[in-house]
């Protein structure tokens, strides 16, 4: 279930797990179903808050990702201590109206009090029924 992602910060992310997805094989996001994501990262700062930002580019067009809970502290224990590893488990209920696409790039960023805590880009996602 471990997937390959491109790090877009300073390699704080140690691993990303998505049920049913492997390595750099296409990862299918199903419309109208929950999409589970787990990431292990090392905190690069002491922070009381942690905010999730998710962007999706679909066939080259950046679109809003609806239904995101931005408070990462709902999914791991805050405050975070610099140098410690944290496991964040997040479930996104994919809207039924999500556009179908074979060319999806997802960027997930976790922001702390002093900037980016972790950042990953997944380039092999697809949205299907």
């Amino acid at each position: 279930d471990q997937v390959d992602v491109k790090d877009c910060a300073n390699h704080e992310i140690k691993k990303v797990l998505v049920p049913g997805c492997h390595g750099s094989e296409p990862c299918i996001i199903h419309r109208g179903k929950p999409f589970q994501l787990e990431a292990v990262f090392e905190a690069n700062q002491n922070t009381k808050t942690a905010k999730i930002e998710i962007k999706a580019s679909i066939d080259g067009l950046e679109v809003d990702v609806p239904g995101i809970d931005p408070n990462a502290c709902h999914y791991m224990k805050c405050p975070l201590v610099k140098g410690q590893q944290y496991d964040i488990k997040y479930t996104w209920n994919v809207p039924k109206i999500a556009p179908k696409s074979e060319n999806v790039v997802v960027t997930v960023k976790v922001m702390g009090d002093d900037g980016v805590l972790a950042c990953a880009i997944a380039t092999h996602a697809k949205i299907r029924d």
């Epitope: 066939d59 950046e62 679109v63 556009p99």
Partner: nanobody, 117 residues
Framework: QVQLVESGGGLVQPGGSLRLSCAAS????????MGWYRQAPGKKRELVAA????????KYADSVKGRFTISRDNAENTMYLQMNSLKPEDTAVYYC??????????WGQGTQVTVSS
């Protein structure tokens, strides 16, 4: 089911302008992205421009970049395509639909754009 009705086409001279409208029968803000497509005689339908819903990011076909501008008004359930510096090769029937995978049932009649002197 959403009905999409295109309008604003016509006959225009090269270098001229047109503004196309796409009116939806119900809310379009539920669509994360929408696009303008065109089909010239004997050719396949192609994407002209696309726009996302809330953050109004845009994407254009290389052939229309710098000449066409896509916009949308979610409150009015309408999408627009401002076409400037029109060329004969822009002649086609223009349609609106969702992006990136158009829904077959959403295709309207389209609006004819003819660029000719």
């Amino acid at each position: 089911q959403v009905q999409l009705v295109e309008s604003g086409g016509g006959l225009v001279q090269p270098g001229g302008s047109l503004r196309l409208s796409c009116a939806a029968s119900r809310s379009i803000d539920r669509f994360p992205a929408m696009g303008w497509y065109r089909q010239a005689p004997g050719k396949k339908r192609e994407l002209v421009a696309a726009i996302s819903s809330a953050n109004t990011r845009t994407k254009y076909a290389d052939s229309v970049k710098g000449r066409f501008t896509i916009s949308r008004d979610n409150a009015e359930n309408t999408m627009y395509l401002q076409m400037n510096s029109l060329k004969p090769e822009d002649t086609a029937v223009y349609y609106c639909n969702v992006f990136p995978r158009p829904v077959q049932g959403y295709w309207g009649q389209g609006t004819q754009v003819t660029v000719s002197s």
